[in-house]
């Protein structure tokens, strides 16, 4: 039961944790005009990984793409390349993790190869997270180091009699977005990681067998995965399985031929 | 059609107050920030104040700064300038203009109330 | 705040001649984000409040005829008319739309002769 759970929720926290990457990834709002101490312009900058957009006084918006791929630097490249990695592991992850879910049968999956599904799919939301917290921190990187750049610009005299209006970047919502998004496919998929050490069989997979206890009218009987939440009669917590490859749903509980002397 | 309608203007003595109003039609105001230009006798243009249309921003120039104040009733459809500590060179036509869609424009120009400050 | 310089500050033209005229500002009004210069021209005519001309330095407005036209970028603008007519004859303001508080040119006065 503790094991289902752990892997439900790993698979939803992965989950809403993917769509947060994916729509940090699409946001515009990367880098938004800092308004703090600047002087102040009747229009609104932010920009994005795809587009850079400005808001004027009235609420119009434009957005313009960067319909360049060498002008572009470098640190942005790799920044949309992690994202994109982020999403296409995270994507990959949430396809093998519906198959590895405890409470969806298919066919006659080995509850092993649940196991090594449920460990592969933790693995690939880990460095799902991963790439999407290092692209966000890149960013932010790149922003705080061009901040102090462009103040240091404003306050140190200019060449010519003419003035340029220093547009600053500061940290825009999709900065929290991918932390936050990142941060949760990581936990999801240590949870995933933590349910594939329930799942997996720890020892060689043996026949059950019904012992006859004297004086006693009690039968050890195959108990399953109930072995390892405290319903079997398991008491050293390890696995027994009945050699079949049947779901925990299939395990039987009632009474049957082999359960009275 | 488009419309602003100024009023308030009269002859204020210095340091005295006065309230200008804008009476607008024709479109929708609460979607529209809104702006206050003046026009002394035989001089430029002179913009005054801004009020965007949700009025969370509201900005003066520095010769009016702390003596006039811009405000908006929505649902009236009117746009206000209070205007205290009134001085000579306070003395033009003020004009009530739309702030245009595209491009940061003044769009629609009312025409205008004549203000004379004088002892 | 930005100044805004118009030259000359009169103009004697006559009927079908091309004009142009001048507004340089103190401060850039290029906006790198959308490529847009935040410049607008108005004319007024004696005894009417102005009508909005151009924005975005070069987009001539609804309704404005097409023998205005407006060019520039950063800090140097003009405003173009190709022929001038006796309608035209008014005072031209070019305005700094980009940074609080918005600021007027003196204007340009376009006379016939």
């Known amino acids: 039961m503790a094991v289902t759970a752990c892997q439900g929720l790993g698979f939803v926290v992965s989950l809403i944790g993917i769509a947060g990457i994916i729509a940090a990834t699409c946001m515009d709002q990367w880098s938004t005009q800092d308004l703090y101490n600047n002087p102040v312009t009747a229009v609104f900058n932010y920009q994005g990984l795809w587009r850079s957009c400005v808001r004027e006084s009235s609420g119009f918006t434009e957005c313009r793409g960067y319909f360049t791929l060498l002008g572009l630097p470098a640190m942005l490249q790799a920044v949309r390349a992690l994202m994109i990695v982020g999403i296409v592991l995270g994507a990959i992850g949430l396809l093998v993790s519906i198959f590895a879910l405890k409470c969806i049968r298919i066919g006659s999956m080995e509850d092993s190869a649940k196991a090594n599904m449920t460990l592969t799919s933790g693995i690939m939301f880990i460095v799902s997270g991963l790439c999407a917290i290092a692209g966000v921190s890149v960013f932010a990187n790149m922003l705080v180091t061009n901040f102090w750049m462009s103040t240091a610009n404003m306050y140190t005299g200019m060449g010519g009699m003419v003035q340029t209006v220093q547009t600053r970047y500061t940290f825009g919502a999709a900065l929290f977005v991918g932390w936050v998004a990142g941060g949760l496919t990581l936990i999801g998929g240590v949870m995933m990681c933590i349910a594939c050490r329930g799942l997996a069989p720890e020892e060689t997979n043996y026949k059950a067998v019904s012992y006859h206890a004297s004086g006693h009218s009690v039968a050890y009987k195959p108990g399953g995965f109930k072995a390892s939440t405290g319903f079997g009669s398991n008491t050293k917590n390890k696995k027994i399985y009945d050699g079949g490859a049947r779901t925990e749903d299939e395990v039987q509980s009632y009474p049957s031929k082999h359960d009275y002397v | 059609v488009v419309q602003l309608v100024e009023s308030g203007g009269d002859f204020v003595q210095p340091g005295g107050s006065r309230k200008l109003s804008c009476a607008v039609s024709?479109?929708?105001?609460?979607?529209?920030?809104m702006h206050w230009v003046r026009q002394a006798p035989e001089k430029g243009l002179e913009w005054v104040a801004y009020?965007?249309?949700?009025?969370?921003?509201?900005y003066y120039a520095d010769t009016v700064k702390g003596r006039f104040t811009v405000s908006r009733d929505n649902p009236k459809n009117s746009l206000f300038l209070h205007m205290t500590s009134l001085r000579s060179e306070d003395t033009a036509m003020y004009y009530c203009?739309?702030?245009?869609?595209?491009?940061?424009?003044?769009?629609?120009w009312g025409q205008g109330t004549p203000l004379t400050v004088s002892s | 705040d930005i100044v805004m310089t118009q030259s000359p500050s009169s103009l004697t033209v006559t009927a079908g001649e091309k004009v142009t005229m001048s507004c340089k500002s103190s401060?850039?009004?290029?906006?790198?984000?959308?490529?847009?210069?935040?410049l607008t021209w108005y004319q007024q005519k004696p005894g009417q409040p102005p009508k909005l001309l151009i924005y975005?330095?070069?987009t001539r407005e609804s309704g404005v005829p097409d023998r205005f036209t407006g060019s520039g970028s950063g800090t140097g603008f003009t405003l173009t008319i190709s022929s001038v007519q006796a309608e035209d004859l008014a005072f031209y303001y070019c305005?700094?739309?980009?940074?609080?508080?918005?600021?007027f040119g003196l204007g340009t006065k376009l006379e016939l002769r």
């Open positions: 975005w330095a070069s």
């Open positions: 024709g479109f929708t105001f609460s979607s529209f920030g």
């Open positions: 009020i965007s249309s949700g009025t969370t921003n509201i």
């Open positions: 401060q850039s009004l290029f906006n790198s984000g959308n490529q847009r210069n935040y």
């Open positions: 203009v739309r702030s245009g869609y595209y491009g940061n424009s003044l769009d629609y």
């Open positions: 305005q700094n739309v980009y940074i609080y508080p918005l600021t």
